[in-house]
Interface confidence: low
Amino acid sequence: LSTCKTIDMELVKRKRIEAIRGQILSKLRLASPPSQGEVPPGPLPEAVLALYNSTRDRVAGESADPEPEPEADYYAKEVTRVLMVDRNNAIYEKTKDISHSIYMFFNTSDIREAVPEPPLLSRAELRLQRLKSSVEQHVELYQKYSNNSWRYLGNRLLTPTDTPEWLSFDVTGVVRQWLNQGDGIQGFRFSAHCSCDSKDNKLHVEINGISPKRRGDLGTIHDMNRPFLLLMATPLERAQHLHSSRHRR
Amino acid sequence: LSTCKTIDMELVKRKRIEAIRGQILSKLRLASPPSQGEVPPGPLPEAVLALYNSTRDRVAGESADPEPEPEADYYAKEVTRVLMVDRNNAIYEKTKDISHSIYMFFNTSDIREAVPEPPLLSRAELRLQRLKSSVEQHVELYQKYSNNSWRYLGNRLLTPTDTPEWLSFDVTGVVRQWLNQGDGIQGFRFSAHCSCDSKDNKLHVEINGISPKRRGDLGTIHDMNRPFLLLMATPLERAQHLHSSRHRR
Amino acid sequence: ALDTNYCFSSTEKNCCVRQLYIDFRKDLGWKWIHEPKGYHANFCLGPCPYIWSLDTQYSKVLALYNQHNPGASASPCCVPQALEPLPIVYYVGRKPKVEQLSNMIVRSCKCS
Amino acid sequence: ALDTNYCFSSTEKNCCVRQLYIDFRKDLGWKWIHEPKGYHANFCLGPCPYIWSLDTQYSKVLALYNQHNPGASASPCCVPQALEPLPIVYYVGRKPKVEQLSNMIVRSCKCS
């Protein structure tokens, strides 16, 4: 099973490098590297680095396996984040004394600013930072559906942890739905899994930026760690390009 | 972007066909096609055809996407099925009047007959035939854990259906666990999703071979349609071969 | 699996994932990607001999199918199996952008 | 996608899934597989031109990356993307066996 052709490893490496040059520009739909003339001096803004790190870090519940990618997914996705509506907002008033759940509301207009059209959205993740905890709990996520009804989205078994840990839930369908509706406040409910016969239905999980004892942290550095939506979307100008070249080869 | 080499399509097809000859024998770990000398005359037994059809048909909740396959998964898996313990068995007595759940028990010794060693099991699916239904319901599956405790395994949102439909749950880990323990009766619970504030926790889903009004069907043709475990496992003799050649290339 | 754990620590001649770090500045002459400075792109390389099952005794050939031609291809090829995305930060004018590029990092290879 | 829907209804010269039905009896001379009698194995075929980005203007080249070399390989290759298993029934002695063979049917291809 030997092969007589000797492989020029250096040539292969260089061909791979040159192909990557084209691949990156192609994924970003750039004909040449972007001009750096207007780039402000100094380091990257904190918020941008935080967003980059959010994207880079694998979090609990995220899959590392690649899916066969549809054509549109070949192109780069712009990553933005939309923070949960501030806990001091009146909308949270009626949810204060519910022990089995915590609530997270989002302003659809903030989401629409990041993703102007529903089809542009390729992924939306709800990210929550869970504080350290010595108990195991089975939790569930719901989407606000109508005035008093909630639609089940998913669940997770949370094991004890010594350090804060980020949780991620895929909420792409939900956010796309919100974008298809008018502006307004939409929300999620994060609940204890209530069994048919169990009596203790209290949520024992503390979420950064929500759990009562942390409420004083808002406006401080912890504000960055309150629940947020991580959005991945095709930028509008790139999508128009994609749409106009939808013919094959 | 034209290529100057003309492709001999017939040669490619022949090479593909010849490669498939080797591939099938290789996956079955056969050095040559098996002798047909002892094959009984007549058509295939009903039960074998039913099993073949169960394997062939994609069912609700099963993924069509291929996973990157570990080495052992390259080889063929023998498919067997183990029916749920008969509903007339005394073990079901104490579960009769529970409205939020139905119960399915299995004899570990039946499973062990099909899969003598836990590592041989590559997939186990619990298959249930849901009867036609006009209601939507969110259901959950649990594994019997200890005397009175149940471990959550998964959930499904069941939409209305005009025809009976097969449901499939991946229970590979659970069955492997059972094989690691001694013989005995083990079980699953199929429940309504009980929310923290909802009052109606009744299971509205009817399962063939379980739901009370169908109990008279047992022992008839419907017996084939009562809940069963579909097991895919490496046959013992093939596994020993695999184990002895675990060195690379 | 023909992954980084196995391939980077062996001298496998056949299909395997090979190490390749790309420094955006040195290798591509690019300073416009602000983060990361480079990444482990890696690549797949090595023969996947075509196994013509009648050419030799089955017993010798069958054991080779799993690695060399598991898909029974007419001309098997060493290609990526597991891939990972790469997030980058760059500027468009004065505006920083974070974008995720899919399938950029090769973690393992296979004969396909 | 380079799947059966697109490829079987077009005259695509580049990488695509090609039709191939295998009749166990006629094509392999086998009578020992009782079910099925054959199956649509299909296969991948067609060039994936290597795109050397400096050989021509970027604008002409970049649009081709998506199909011809999305993985930025040094030598892209037309290989299966989506595969499906094949269950078979055969006898060992007097005992019928149902076995599932993984990744036997090619549903779509890709340049990788």
Epitope: E10, L11, A31, S32, S35 | - | G29, K31 | L54
Partner: antibody, heavy 124, light 108 residues
Framework: QVQLVESGGGLVQPGGSLTLSCAAS????????MTWVRQAPGKGLEWVSS????????YYADSVKGRFTISRDNAKDTLYLQMNDLKSEDTAVYYC?????????????????WGKGTLVTVSS | QSALTQPSTVSVSLGQMARITCQGG??????AHWYQQKPGQAPVLVIH???SRPSGIPERFSGSRSGGTATLTISGAQADDEGVYFC???????????FGGGTELTVL
């Protein structure tokens, strides 16, 4: 230390041919992209041709395309420029230059080492 | 006609700062490199990738690029800095490396 020494220049009539050589030392020649640059008397620098480290890819200025051929022999650490159908406007000092980076296309990169040059005069 | 435009001459007093500019081509997107050439000698790289100095080049040499203009700065010019300075970049429309016409620096 890095050295590049050009040779092969001289006087040639229009329509004639000449082959320039550049002997390299002090670095791993086979890893680097190499370039020929020329300078007409009293004028600026003009890029002529570049070649990939393995010789697999070659690039030419429009003014010399079809007449000049760049090549290399990595076993001998030598770069060549075969010049045919020479014209009076090809009169210049021809420099051989090494790219600053490995794995890198010279189209974008600086050239960190240059030879002293060899004069080519095309005149009748 | 060069694809990159440089002033043909720049004069500077000894010890003062000299600035040579280079415009055009694809300088909005691609790096600039600078070479010094003395009469009868080969060019010498003094700045590469806009602002990187090769070893052996004095610290008084620096470079920058903003928008479509690259600038070579000599802070405290010395008599030895006299010569012709060429900028070099890539022109994406020609798909080729390009040089400026050269700037003769005189130190007074």
């Amino acid at each position: 230390q890095v050295q590049l020494v050009e040779s092969g220049g001289g006087l040639v009539q229009p329509g004639g041919s000449l082959t320039l050589s550049c002997a390299a030392s002090g670095f791993t020649f086979s890893n680097y992209y190499m370039t020929w640059v020329r300078q007409a008397p009293g004028k600026g620098l003009e890029w002529v041709s570049s070649i990939y480290s393995t010789g697999s890819h070659t690039y030419y200025a429009d003014s010399v395309k079809g007449r000049f051929t760049i090549s290399r022999d990595n076993a001998k650490d030598t770069l060549y420029l075969q010049m045919n159908d020479l014209k009076s406007e090809d009169t210049a000092v021809y420099y051989c230059a090494k790219n600053i980076y490995t794995y890198y296309t010279a189209h974008y990169a600086g050239m960190d080492y240059w030879g002293k040059g060899t004069l080519v005069t095309v005149s009748s | 006609q060069s694809a990159l435009t440089q002033p043909s001459t720049v004069s500077v007093s000894l010890g003062q700062m000299a600035r040579i500019t280079c415009q055009g081509g694809s300088l909005g997107s691609y790096d600039a490199h600078w070479y010094q050439q003395k009469p009868g000698q080969a060019p010498v790289l003094v700045i590469h990738d806009d602002n990187s100095r090769p070893s052996g080049i004095p610290e008084r040499f620096s470079g920058s690029r903003s928008g479509g203009t690259a600038t070579l700065t000599i802070s405290g010019a010395q008599a030895d800095d006299e010569g012709v300075y060429f900028c070099h970049s890539y022109d994406s429309s020609a798909n080729a490396p390009v040089f400026g016409g050269g700037t003769e620096l005189t130190v007074l």
